[in-house]
């Protein structure tokens, strides 16, 4: 009840009081990506730095093989930013010739994989058309939201084109999650 | 252990139970910027409204001289949005003439200053090329992530060009942090 | 005091310890919008999915008639992303003819309604000029920040043009809030 004091005698097993500093948390930062085969019709996943610089994982939140592993069930805030950079796209040349065109685009997806499900679940997507004329371009896509996750769930960040990801600085491209 | 009840006898000194309403928190909103000298090769810092309107600081999180002061060590979620607005950039004229060009850009950086470190640490950066043709333009850059901060750390928001920041409304440009 | 153990005897009534899993939380996802009359000079509000797929409301946070209802006073993190999509705007044609023009724009506002206030309060605004040349375009606007809300407050998401909102996928356009 509102205003009720949650002394131990009031605790429910399913929602114990717990020290905030003990909650699973991770902030991962970008590293240079190694070329890998990715499944057709599936965006490639980024891999991440998990302990150097600003990056960390704590309280049983582990990072392995491009995935953040969810160590306990609960509501998590999950976020990522990917900074993209590129040269003039073909799209702009076609557009200059006056022919409308489905533009080039950049996309970030935060994906959940559950071993018992055959298909990954897309939790968050940021997608943007890019039709730049006559120049280099760069821009970030930011995503963040709360999800109910289960112990054993795995999170990854997929992008439409790994070669466009700016991997030069840990503050430009990152991925994180924390138990609320 | 999962499901363990965190009654007082189980508490660790380094991670005590604590009332959520007692945690350091701040949400700062934009105000008109006063012209100030800033260091060469360093983006100027914004200053903020700390208590009028939607703005607040609480539980020992203080704002002073463009900095948010971190009153206790822990993991914080830090966020900012800066809305930029401008006129057509020169870049667009060069582009119209068909010459590729490094575009004009807008950048936001959330920076951590630690007195014992000589160099500030860039926690988050949002940077975007801007090549607009024949019009006024406006757009936001949003940033947010979790960081392990130490008591005494100071946070600020730096921008590439203060004159492009939209300071007209508290909901367009803001900066905040809260202990998780 | 810093480092103090918040055992029940130290609890204050106004800030009781409480189980995190018991806090009001919601994540709402996009659905196809039904055309509705909206007030002149006020952006239309989106309505949302509250229980299917990734969407949920819990712990007395309820969704009704386009509003999230705040069930208890406190500091909330509130967020939304809206993905917009459109065809070439007139603005681009005018621009191609060489006449500067106030550009078309897309705007998202997270608004608080308090029954005792005559006017809604705009908590967050993301606004972006859109001047695309010769193509379909799409892009997200993301917002998120912390606010002190009162029991009975209502939150909604308003957009500049409902017909431009991408309602096709729950991961592209969403709205959420959780008590910190």
């Amino acid at each position: 009840l509102k205003g009720q004091e949650f002394a131990p005698s009031h605790q429910q097993v399913y929602a114990p009081l717990r020290a905030d500093g003990d909650k699973p948390r991770a902030h991962l930062t970008v590293v240079r990506q190694t070329p890998t085969q990715h499944l057709k019709n599936q965006f490639p996943a980024l891999h991440w730095e998990h302990e150097l610089g600003l990056a960390f994982t704590k309280n049983r939140m582990n990072y392995t093989n491009k995935f953040l592993l969810i160590p306990e069930s609960g509501d998590y805030f999950v976020y990522s930013q990917v900074t993209f950079r590129g040269m003039t796209s073909e799209c702009s040349e076609i557009r200059q010739a006056g022919r409308p065109n489905k533009p080039d685009s950049i996309t970030v997806v935060i994906t959940k994989v559950t071993d018992s499900y055959p298909e990954p679940t897309q939790l968050l997507m940021g997608t943007k058309s890019v039709c730049e004329v006559g120049s280099n371009w760069f821009q970030p896509i930011y995503l963040g939201a709360m999800f109910s996750l289960q112990e054993g769930d795995k999170l990854m960040v997929n992008v439409s084109d790994i070669s466009l990801v700016d991997y030069t600085k840990e503050d430009k491209t990152f991925f994180g999650a924390f138990l609320l | 252990l999962k499901g363990q009840e965190f009654a007082p006898s189980h508490q660790q000194v380094y991670a005590p139970l604590r009332a959520d309403g007692d945690k350091p928190r701040a949400h700062l909103t934009v105000v008109r910027q006063t012209p100030t000298q800033h260091l060469k090769n360093q983006f100027p810092a914004l200053h903020w409204e700390h208590e009028l309107g939607l703005a607040f600081t609480k539980n020992r999180m203080n704002y002073t001289n463009k900095f948010l002061l971190i009153p206790e060590s822990g993991d914080y979620f830090v966020y900012s949005q800066v809305t930029f607005r401008g006129m057509t950039s020169e870049c667009s004229e060069i582009r119209q003439a068909g010459r590729p060009n490094k575009p004009d850009s807008i950048t936001v950086v959330i920076t951590k200053v630690t007195d014992s470190y000589p160099e500030p640490t860039q926690l988050l950066m949002g940077t975007k090329s801007v090549c607009e043709v024949g019009s006024n333009w406006f757009q936001p850059i949003y940033l947010g992530a979790m960081f392990s901060l130490q008591e005494g750390d100071k946070l600020m928001v730096n921008v590439s060009d203060i004159s492009l920041v939209d300071y007209t409304k508290e909901d367009k440009t803001f900066f905040g942090a809260f202990l998780l | 005091l810093k480092g103090q153990e918040f055992a029940p005897s130290h609890q204050q009534v106004y800030a009781p310890l409480r189980a995190d899993g018991d806090k009001p939380r919601a994540h709402l996802t996009v659905v196809r919008q039904t055309p509705t009359q909206h007030l002149k000079n006020q952006f239309p509000a989106l309505h949302w999915e509250h229980e299917l797929g990734l969407a949920f409301t819990k712990n007395r946070m309820n969704y009704t008639n386009k509003f999230l209802l705040i069930p208890e006073s406190g500091d909330y993190f509130v967020y939304s992303q809206v993905t917009f999509r459109g065809m070439t705007s007139e603005c681009s044609e005018i621009r191609q003819a060489g006449r500067p023009n106030k550009p078309d724009s897309i705007t998202v506002v997270i608004t608080k309604v308090t029954d005792s206030y005559p006017e809604p309060t705009q908590l967050l605004m993301g606004t972006k000029s859109v001047c695309e040349v010769g193509s379909n375009w799409f892009q997200p606007i993301y917002l998120g920040a912390m606010f002190s809300l009162q029991e009975g407050d209502k939150l909604m998401v308003n957009v500049s043009d409902i017909s431009l909102v991408d309602y096709t996928k729950e991961d592209k356009t969403f709205f959420g809030a959780f008590l910190l």
Partner: antibody, heavy 118, light 107 residues
Amino acid sequence: QVQLQESGPGLVKPSETLSLTCTVSGGSISSYFWSWIRQPPGKGLEWIGYIYYSGNTKYNPSLKSRVTISIDTSKNQFSLKLSSVTAADTAVYYCARETGSYYGFDYWGQGTLVTVSS
Amino acid sequence: DIQMTQSPSSLSASVGDRVTITCRASQSINNYLNWYQQRPGKAPKLLIYAASSLQSGVPSRFSGSGSGTDFTLTISSLQPGDFATYYCQQSYSTPRTFGQGTKLEIK
């Protein structure tokens, strides 16, 4: 140039409600904080409260139970109501603008004297 | 509430004099301190904001200094129009509070 002008009755009876309006000209009422401040004859300045264009208000705790400040953005006006007045509420009432905490009250009305007397 | 205490409460000086008025806050207000001049029958006028920033249009003989709890307004060379009452005001928190005023009179 921004100008503020207070208007309202100069005489109010005890126990009644004092009502004043401030009209802002030469600029928009949006994006600023609009305060009422009063000064009893021969005494110092007392802040009553502010309103933001969105309707967000904050009042001096010493007066909070009796004060209501409202705003009409379409008319570029904001108003003060002070209920249950006594002779101690006799003062010159000023409206003033604050851009933000950093900047102080940069524009003031000329003030209007309100006397509480039967 | 934050209490603001000005000293002196009154001051006599002559044209051309250098005058200093002090203001003390009951707790730290960083640099959120403003100074106003009020002539008889007129509204206050902002002179200095943020402890030391000169408001546009105010003569440069007015200056402010200080931070935390102790602040000073200095008039470097008094002019005839400067004889008035001066108030300090904190804008660090609400309620906004003013000092009791310093009346500057001609000697």
